[in-house]
């Protein structure tokens, strides 16, 4: 006996479609070998019609496909627009030739069955409603009107004009007449289910003079839309259920064997597996909404259904829309860490991937918030200014062309822990989710700035030093001036950085920044950081206040960031002077200036503005220098 298994017989009608599932034994070879569907001829030859190698015969062109599901050890042959010519004997099988392992399938396609010649066909989707029109002669106007459903032996009453209603149609069936027209009555049936499909007879009057009409009601389940997405990419389910359910709660659920498990609904329910990577967005008053899922995983593949009901849960007889989601593991989206860990007072540098073909797209970083339907307010973007509460501690560095931009967040607190999204206004598949975890710091920070009291005096020279540990010895050190449009890296003279050393004195590694002479424009946040090429590492921030010279002035720290700085050892520094003044740039309102939220993320308008480099938006000229002290013992 063959180890391949499937349906021995399949019967259908012209114009319909079939999905034939063939099961194969669970082995690696079987999962990867060629799958085929062939038709057996009188000579015993089996002619390939379609195979998993991409072959498709002329007679199947545009109406058939073959999909392998290695995770289930099955493959499916879908054939549409059947004709009686498709009747015959077939094989589904595995192997490089059609003489491999196979299973015989008999397909029979019949003519569409004849309905009584006067039958009116109504075709409706599940959950919708139908209004059946029943004409009658004027002499039957005073008589009883009724609609019944044909069963094997009889015709079972659905509803009549004496207000009799079948129990399974209570609250769903209405018999009525419109205006003064006495030649037609109507029956409306709402919340249609599969069980409502069948033949009906509407009747006015009794006996031989009665008016009768045959009705065929077809109730269709929606065809699932096939969605093919890459691992780690994102998917948007666009759900359009119609105006009649506009005011009902909406949901998205995933089918499992027995039920459809709700993943998210507009009543606040959310599956923990989707925490941080899902949003539900009501679109308009017509019952349209969308659900966005980012960071797709292998296990997200499956059959999804959206719907509407006051309970926020799937309910028979309510409109639905369905999708089959396939997640391709051979993804174009690079595998990045999905969890980034930081410590209080420290910093994180998050590398966000984007489609390298869209280097000029606008880049954004938003924080996912799970309250309500979930939303993702933008915190920073290439043309979106940093949100006020992140002043001095958040910047986006765009590295055009290499498919990555970096977001740096420093002065971390435990409040910063949560989920963040990287996204652009271009290819929406490249939306990625990062979970930021923040632990309490248990040791001194790696980077420390001195002096702690960073108050510079107008017209004078002011130097700040950034101390770094030996482990950062070979990395590039930099200072940058922060503005709400980025952190502009200052030119530096890196002295002695390339010379080799026998040992590294932990206390004497530093990079300094000198402001000479200090101007009012120098006031603000400065960052000291390390990087290796385009890969950014740790940073620390300091606020430099600028004030006029006054006798006996006492300085107050403007922020608690400086309070966290540690007093450093006295070290020799190399000065470098600055004479250029900062170019004032007019702030450019970001694309989400009015409503800084990614909600209709699928609908983001393409920006017409050219993308600005957040790392150089400031046009400032300042400098920093570093000196390495080498001690030989």
């Amino acid at each position: 006996k063959s180890p391949i298994f499937g349906p021995q017989e399949v019967s259908s009608i012209e114009g319909d479609s079939v999905s034939i599932t063939c099961y194969y034994p669970d082995t690696s070879v079987n999962r990867h070998t060629r799958k085929y569907w062939c038709r057996q001829g009188a000579s015993g030859m089996c002619t390939t019609l379609i195979s998993s190698n991409g072959y498709l015969s002329k007679e199947y062109s545009g109406r058939a496909n073959l999909i392998n599901f290695p995770e289930n050890n099955t493959f499916v042959i879908n054939i549409e627009q059947l004709t009686q010519d498709d009747t015959g004997s077939y094989k589904c099988g595995l192997g490089t030739s059609n003489r491999g392992l196979s299973f015989d399938v008999s397909l029979e396609v019949s003519q569409v069955p004849e309905l009584p010649s006067d039958t009116h066909v109504y075709t409706k989707d599940i959950g919708r409603n139908v209004t059946i029109e029943c004409p009658f002669k004027r002499e039957n106007a005073p008589s009883k009107k009724s609609l019944c459903k044909k069963t094997n032996q009889s015709c079972e009453l659905v509803i009549d004009s004496t207000e009799k209603v079948n129990p399974s149609y209570i609250g769903r069936a209405k018999l009525f007449m419109k205006g003064t027209d006495l030649t037609v009555f109507y029956v409306n049936i709402s919340h249609l289910t599969h069980n409502d499909a069948g033949l009906y007879i509407c009747q006015a009057g009794e006996g031989p003079s009665a008016d009768k009409k045959n009705v065929d009601l077809q109730v269709l389940a929606p065809e699932p839309e096939l969605l093919y997405k890459d691992l780690r990419s994102s998917v948007t389910f666009e759900c359009d259920l119609g105006r009649e359910v506009a005011n009902e709660a909406k949901y998205l659920c995933r089918m499992n064997k027995e039920t459809c498990d709700v993943i998210i609904n507009t009543l606040g329910k959310r599956d923990p597996d989707f925490e941080g990577r899902i949003l539900i967005t009501p679109k308009d008053d017509n019952g349209r909404f969308s659900v966005l899922i980012t960071g797709l995983r292998k296990e997200d593949a499956g059959h999804y259904q959206c719907g509407a009901h006051s309970s926020g849960l799937p309910q028979e007889g309510w409109p639905i829309q369905t999708w089959q989601l396939f997640v391709n593991e051979e993804s174009t989206i690079p595998n990045r860490r999905s969890v980034v860990k930081g410590v209080t007072g420290g910093s994180v540098a998050i590398a966000c991937p984007y489609n390298p073909k869209e280097s000029s797209s606008l880049k954004y970083w938003c924080r996912w918030e799970g309250d309500g339907n979930g939303h993702c307010p933008v915190l920073v973007g290439t043309q979106a200014q940093v949100q006020e509460e992140y002043e001095g501690r958040l910047a986006l560095f765009d590295q055009p062309g290499n498919g990555t931009y970096t977001v740096i967040l420093n002065q971390l607190t435990t409040e910063d822990a949560g989920f963040y999204w990287c996204l652009t206004n271009g290819d929406s598949r490249w939306r990625t989710t990062i979970e930021l975890q923040v632990a309490e710091a248990t040791r001194e920070p790696n980077l420390e700035v001195t002096p702690q009291n960073a108050t510079a005096v107008l017209g004078e020279t002011f130097t700040v030093s950034c101390h770094y540990p030996c482990k950062f010895y070979s990395q590039e050190k930099y200072w940058c001036k922060w503005s709400n449009k980025g952190c502009h890296i200052l030119p530096s003279h890196d002295e002695g950085a390339r010379q080799s050393s026998v040992s590294c004195d932990q206390s004497s590694q530093l990079v300094s920044m000198t402001l000479n002479p200090v101007s009012k424009e120098d006031e603000g946040w400065y960052w000291c950081g390390v990087k290796q090429g385009q890969t950014y590492g740790e940073t620390t921030a300091i606020y430099i206040a600028v004030e006029e010279r006054t006798r006996g002035s006492s300085h107050v720290n403007p922020t608690d960031a400086n309070a966290r700085a540690k007093v450093a050892l006295e070290e020799e520094v190399v000065d470098s002077s600055i004479s250029e003044k900062e170019n004032k740039a007019i702030p450019n309102p970001g694309p989400f200036a009015n409503e800084r939220e990614i909600q209709n993320v699928g609908d983001q308008a393409q920006e017409n503005r050219a993308s600005g480099d957040a790392g150089s938006a400031d046009g400032q000229s300042r400098s920093s220098s570093s000196k390495h002290h080498h001690h030989h013992h």
Partner: nanobody
């Protein structure tokens, strides 16, 4: 609550025929698939046949290896009844025959794990 009730079992001579019925009741029964299994004394439950319908006009018929054209599974015009027509019966067909239905979509129809509702069974005895 969904209930499946089998009927039509009994004693029959080898070479004879029987027609088993499986009737589903309960408001929530909306399965589009029904399977037949059998269990002979001291043996494991074994797959006999499965029918799956898609819409009004497309039907898929699956059979166990031993059937070899002797049995036919079909659906009654009332959508809640499924029949198993058994011809050319052999003594080794003696067993309790069960019908089963899944709540939703089904994987491999041969696996008992795929079915959620089971009938009490009907005994078929084939004498030689």
């Amino acid at each position: 609550e969904v209930q499946l009730v089998e009927s039509g079992g009994g004693l029959v001579q080898a070479g004879g025929s029987l027609r088993l019925s499986c009737a589903a009741s309960g408001r929530t029964f909306s399965s589009d698939a029904v399977g037949w299994f059998r269990q002979a004394p001291g043996k494991e439950r074994e797959f006999v046949a499965h029918i799956h319908w898609s819409g009004d006009f497309t039907t898929y018929y699956y059979y166990g290896d031993f059937v070899k054209g002797r049995f036919t599974i079909s659906r009654g015009t009332a959508k809640n009844t499924v029949y198993l027509q058994m011809n050319s019966l052999k003594p080794e067909d003696t067993a309790v025959y069960y019908c089963a239905a899944p709540k939703g979509a089904i994987g491999d129809p041969r696996s008992t794990r795929e079915y959620d509702y089971w009938g009490q069974g009907t005994l078929v005895t084939v004498s030689s």
